[in-house]
C-alpha cells in the first residue's frame, strides 16, 4: 500500500545525519523501476532541505536537528514515478510530528508585577494574577507546564506567609488576616515559575503588593481639651483650632476630618469647619455671645471622617472651655425710636418727655444724655434723667424743620465704661396742631376796572389743620365796605371781592378780615389797583397818573 503512518521525530536529535526515518515503497516497483521524491515545506520549499528521500530506495532522510518550537509538524507529499517520468501513484501525505524536549525555561511576562489590596481584607481575597510562559509543549508533555510558587516575602510582618499563589493560575491571594497599611504599606514577593509542573527549570520575578487604605483608624484629638477667650457680641470670631491626628492616608476621605458640636451649644452660637489643608477644626462664633447672660460655655466636639469607618471604632471627643469676655456695650435707647405727641407752641421749659437708655452691661454704669441733632434748637435734654424739655417754640407749621407734622430729633446716651460707649435714639415729636394761624387770602394784590368790574376771586389758606380751617368767614373793616363787598363761597375756601361803587383810577387798600372755623381772625390788607376801563383788566391802560 502506498501509505505511511505519521512519523514522530524528537527535536534536537543528535544524528548522525542524514538520519533514516522511514521508507516510502510503492508495490508498483514489481512491474517497473520506481523513482521516489518528496515535496512540501521542509523539502523543496522553505525551509528547504530539512528532509530528503533516497531516489531509488525511497528512504526518507532527516538532514538536521529539528526545533519543535519553530515547526512542530511537517506536512510533505511523497511521489512515485516510473523511468519515463509517469506518475505511478497518487501523491501520498507524509506527516512528520516533532516531539518536544524540555529545552526552554519558563519566562515571566513582566519583571515586576504590581497589584493592590485593601487593608484588613479576609483571607481568600484575590490580589492579582501573574503569568509566565514556556515555549515547550504543555499538552502532550509536562515540559511546558508551569507551576507558580512564592519564594519569599518582604517584609515578613506580621508574619512571612501573608499571601499564597495558585500553583497553576498564578493568582495571588491573601492567606492570612492582619494586613495593616499603617504598619506595612507594601509587600515585595519573589515569585517563581517552574516547568515540568514544578519539577523542572525555574525562573523568578517580583510581585509588589500595595496595601490600600481603609478607614480603620479614627481621628484623635490632640489635645483633647482647650481653653479659649472670646469677646462677647463677636460674630465669625475664631475661637480655637482643634487638632486631630489620623493614621489613615493623608488627604483621603478616610483621613479628612468632619467635626460636630455634640453638646454645650444650646443657643446654636458656635460653628465648626474643617481646614482644607491642615485638617484642623476651626471653631468660630455663629452668633454673638452675651457675657451678661452666660460668661462661660463648655463645648463638646466629636470628630469622624468623611468616609465611614470600616469597623466599629471609638470616636474622639474634645472639650472646649470658652470664657466669654465682657465688652463695654453701648447703651440702648428703649425704644430705639420713640414717638411722642406734643402740642405745638408749648411754653419754654415745659417737659416734652423722658427718653432713657438701658446698658446691657451688668455693672451699674452711669448713663449721661445729650441731644445730638435738634435742627431748630427747640429742645434740651437733662444729662442725668433723660428729661426732654422745650427751650424754643415748637411750630408745627415750620416747613423748614417739620415734615408731615413730625419733628425729628436724635439723642445720645454715653456710659462711663472704659472706654466709654455711646448709643443713639430717635425722638419723633408728633406736633399737635393748635389754632395759631388765621386764614390768609391769595393773591393780595388785585387789578380791577372801575366800569363793569369783574369779581375778584381770592383763595383762602390757613396753615393750621382741620378743624382750625374752613369754613372761613370774611368781613371788610375800616370803611372798606363802602366801596367793596366780600363774600365767602359755598365751600368756604375762597372769598369773592367786588367793587360796588365807582372809584377813580388809583391804588386803594382794602381791609379784609378773615376768620377760620375756630374763630381765629386774621386782618389782611389787599392792595387794589383801580383802572379806568371796562370789564376785565390785568394792567391799567394809558399813562399812569396815580399818586
Amino acid at each position: 500500500d502506498w501509505v505511511v503512518a505519521p512519523i514522530s521525530v524528537p527535536e534536537n536529535g543528535k544524528g548522525p545525519f542524514p538520519q533514516r526515518l522511514n521508507q516510502l515503497k510503492s508495490n508498483k516497483d514489481r512491474d517497473t523501476k520506481i523513482f521516489y521524491s518528496i515535496t512540501g515545506p521542509g523539502a523543496d520549499s522553505p525551509p528547504e532541505g530539512v528532509f530528503a528521500v533516497e531516489k531509488e530506495t525511497g528512504w526518507l532522510l532527516l538532514n538536521k536537528p529539528l526545533d519543535r518550537e519553530e515547526i512542530a509538524k511537517y506536512e510533505l507529499f511523497g511521489h512515485a514515478v516510473s523511468e519515463n517520468g509517469a506518475s505511478v501513484e497518487d501523491p501520498m501525505n507524509i506527516s512528520i510530528i516533532v516531539t518536544d524536549q524540555n529545552d526552554h525555561k519558563p519566562k515571566f511576562t513582566q519583571d515586576t508585577f504590581r497589584g493592590s489590596v485593601l487593608e484588613g481584607v479576609l483571607p481568600g481575597t484575590s490580589v492579582m494574577q501573574v503569568t509566565a510562559t514556556d515555549e515547550d509543549d504543555a499538552i502532550y508533555t509536562y515540559n511546558g507546564v508551569v507551576a507558580y510558587s512564592i519564594h519569599s516575602q518582604e517584609p515578613k510582618d506580621p508574619h512571612d506567609l501573608m499571601f499564597t499563589i495558585h500553583r497553576s493560575t498564578g493568582t495571588i491571594s491573601v492567606i492570612s488576616s492582619g494586613l495593616d497599611r499603617e504598619k506595612v504599606p507594601e509587600y515585595t514577593l519573589t515569585i517563581q515559575a517552574t516547568d515540568m509542573d514544578g519539577d523542572g527549570s525555574t525562573t523568578t520575578a517580583v510581585a509588589v503588593v500595595e496595601i490600600l487604605d481603609a478607614n480603620d483608624n479614627a481621628p484623635m484629638f490632640d489635645p483633647q481639651k482647650y481653653e479659649a477667650h472670646v469677646p462677647e457680641n463677636a460674630v465669625g470670631h475664631e475661637v480655637q483650632r482643634l487638632t486631630v491626628t489620623d493614621l489613615d492616608a493623608p488627604n483621603s476621605p478616610a483621613w479628612r476630618a468632619t467635626y460636630l458640636i455634640m453638646g454645650g451649644d444650646d443657643g446654636d452660637h458656635f460653628t465648626i469647619t474643617t481646614h482644607p489643608e491642615s485638617n484642623q477644626g476651626i471653631l468660630t462664633t455663629r452668633k454673638g455671645l452675651d457675657f451678661e447672660a452666660k460668661n462661660q460655655h463648655t463645648l463638646y466636639v466629636e470628630v469622624t471622617n468623611e468616609a465611614p469607618f470600616v469597623l466599629k471604632l471609638p470616636t474622639s471627643t474634645a472639650t472646649i472651655v470658652v470664657h466669654v469676655e465682657d465688652v463695654n456695650e453701648a447703651p440702648v435707647f428703649v425704644p430705639p425710636s420713640k414717638v411722642v405727641e406734643v402740642q405745638e407752641g408749648i411754653p419754654t421749659g415745659e417737659p416734652v418727655c423722658v427718653y432713657t437708655a438701658e446698658d446691657p452691661d451688668k455693672e451699674n454704669q452711669k448713663i449721661s444724655y445729650r441731644i445730638l441733632r435738634d435742627p431748630a434748637g427747640w429742645l434740651a435734654m437733662d444729662p442725668d434723667s433723660g428729661q426732654v424739655t422745650a427751650v424754643g417754640t415748637l411750630d408745627r407749621e415750620d416747613e423748614q424743620f417739620v415734615r408731615n407734622n413730625i419733628y425729628e430729633v436724635m439723642v445720645l446716651a454715653m456710659d462711663n465704661g472704659s472706654p466709654p460707649t455711646t448709643g443713639t435714639g430717635t425722638l419723633l415729636l408728633t406736633l399737635i396742631d393748635v389754632n395759631d394761624h388765621g386764614p390768609v387770602p391769595e393773591p393780595r394784590q388785585i387789578t380791577i376796572c372801575n366800569q363793569s368790574p369783574v369779581r375778584q376771586v381770592l383763595n383762602i389758606t390757613d396753615k393750621d389743620l382741620s378743624p382750625h380751617t374752613s369754613p372761613f368767614q370774611a368781613q371788610l373793616t375800616d370803611d372798606s365796605d363802602i366801596y367793596w363787598t366780600a363774600e365767602v363761597n359755598e365751600e368756604g375756601d375762597t372769598v369773592v371781592l367786588s367793587l360796588k361803587k365807582f372809584l377813580k383810577q388809583d391804588t386803594y387798600d382794602v381791609h379784609l378780615s378773615l376768620s377760620d372755623h375756630g374763630n381765629k381772625e386774621q386782618l389782611t390788607v389787599i392792595r387794589a389797583t383801580v383802572c379806568d376801563c371796562h370789564g376785565h383788566v390785568e394792567t391799567c391802560p394809558g399813562p399812569w397818573k396815580g399818586g
Partner: antibody, heavy 118, light 103 residues
Framework: QVQLQQPGAELVKPGTSVKLSCKSS????????IHWVKQRPGHGLEWIGE????????YYNQNFKGKATLTIDKSSSTAYMQLNSLTSEDSAVFYC???????????WGQGTLVTVSA | QIVLTQSPAIMSSSPGEKVTMSCSAT?????MYWYQQKPGSSPKPWIF???NLASGVPTRFSGSGSGTSYSLTISSMEAEDAATYYC?????????FGGGTKL
C-alpha cells in the same frame, strides 16, 4: 486682685529633680488653666505646657514631654511643675501664667530661677 | 509646629522716632499676641488679637498684620518703651513665642 506667687530661686544638683510651685489667689482657681513658660538667660520664651485645675488635664509641648510633669493641689490653689533628670540646659527662669482677656497670658508669676550646678 | 521669627533681633531708636518690628510665621495664624519684658521682670501682656492694646498700654503702640506677617509699631518712641518684645500665637499647639526683638 489676681496673683500668682512663685519662690524666687532653687539651686539643684545635676541628675536630680525639682518641684516648682505657683500659688494662685484672687480668682476661682478651677476656672482658668495654668501655663508654664521657660526662659533661659539671654534666650526667648518657651511654652512648656498647660494644666486645667478643674480636672488635672495636661497638655505638653513635645520638647518637654518626660522632662516636665504638671500637677495641681486644689485645696491650696497651687500648681506644681516637677522637672526631672536636671542638666545645665535646665538652668532657667520658669514662669507660671494664667490666660485671660483676649487669650493673652494676662497674669504671670515672678518666676523661679532654677540653677543646676554640682 | 509653627515657628515665629522676629526681626530685627536688636534695634535702637531715639525718642520721638517711629519704630516698627515684625514677626513672621512659618504658616498662617489667625491672630498674633505681643508681650513686653524688661530685665528682671516677668513678661507683660501688650497686644492681643493682632491689634488690640492690653489694659494700660499707651496708645502710641499699635499692632497689625494677617496670615504669616505681623508687626508692632510705636508711633513715637519714648524712653520707657525700651524693652524686649515677644510675639506669640495661641490657636495652634504648641503655643510658641518668637525669639524677641530687643529695643
Amino acid at each position: 486682685q489676681v496673683q500668682l506667687q512663685q519662690p524666687g530661686a532653687e539651686l539643684v544638683k545635676p541628675g536630680t529633680s525639682v518641684k516648682l510651685s505657683c500659688k494662685s489667689s484672687g480668682y476661682t482657681f478651677t476656672s482658668y488653666w495654668i501655663h508654664w513658660v521657660k526662659q533661659r538667660p539671654g534666650h526667648g520664651l518657651e511654652w512648656i505646657g498647660e494644666i486645667d485645675p478643674s480636672d488635672n488635664y495636661t497638655y505638653y509641648n513635645q520638647n518637654f514631654k518626660g522632662k516636665a510633669t504638671l500637677t495641681i493641689d486644689k485645696s491650696s490653689s497651687t500648681a506644681y511643675m516637677q522637672l526631672n533628670s536636671l542638666t545645665s540646659e535646665d538652668s532657667a527662669v520658669f514662669y507660671c501664667a494664667r490666660s485671660g482677656y483676649g487669650n493673652l497670658f494676662v497674669y504671670w508669676g515672678q518666676g523661679t530661677l532654677v540653677t543646676v550646678s554640682a | 509646629q509653627i515657628v515665629l521669627t522676629q526681626s530685627p533681633a536688636i534695634m535702637s531708636s531715639s525718642p520721638g522716632e517711629k519704630v516698627t518690628m515684625s514677626c513672621s510665621a512659618t504658616s498662617s495664624v489667625t491672630y498674633m499676641y505681643w508681650y513686653q519684658q524688661k530685665p528682671g521682670s516677668s513678661p507683660k501682656p501688650w497686644i492681643f488679637r493682632t491689634s488690640n492694646l492690653a489694659s494700660g498700654v499707651p496708645t502710641r503702640f499699635s499692632g497689625s498684620g494677617s496670615g504669616t506677617s505681623y508687626s508692632l509699631t510705636i508711633s513715637s518712641m519714648e524712653a520707657e518703651d525700651a524693652a524686649t518684645y515677644y510675639c506669640q500665637h495661641y490657636h495652634i499647639y504648641p503655643r510658641t513665642f518668637g525669639g524677641g526683638t530687643k529695643l
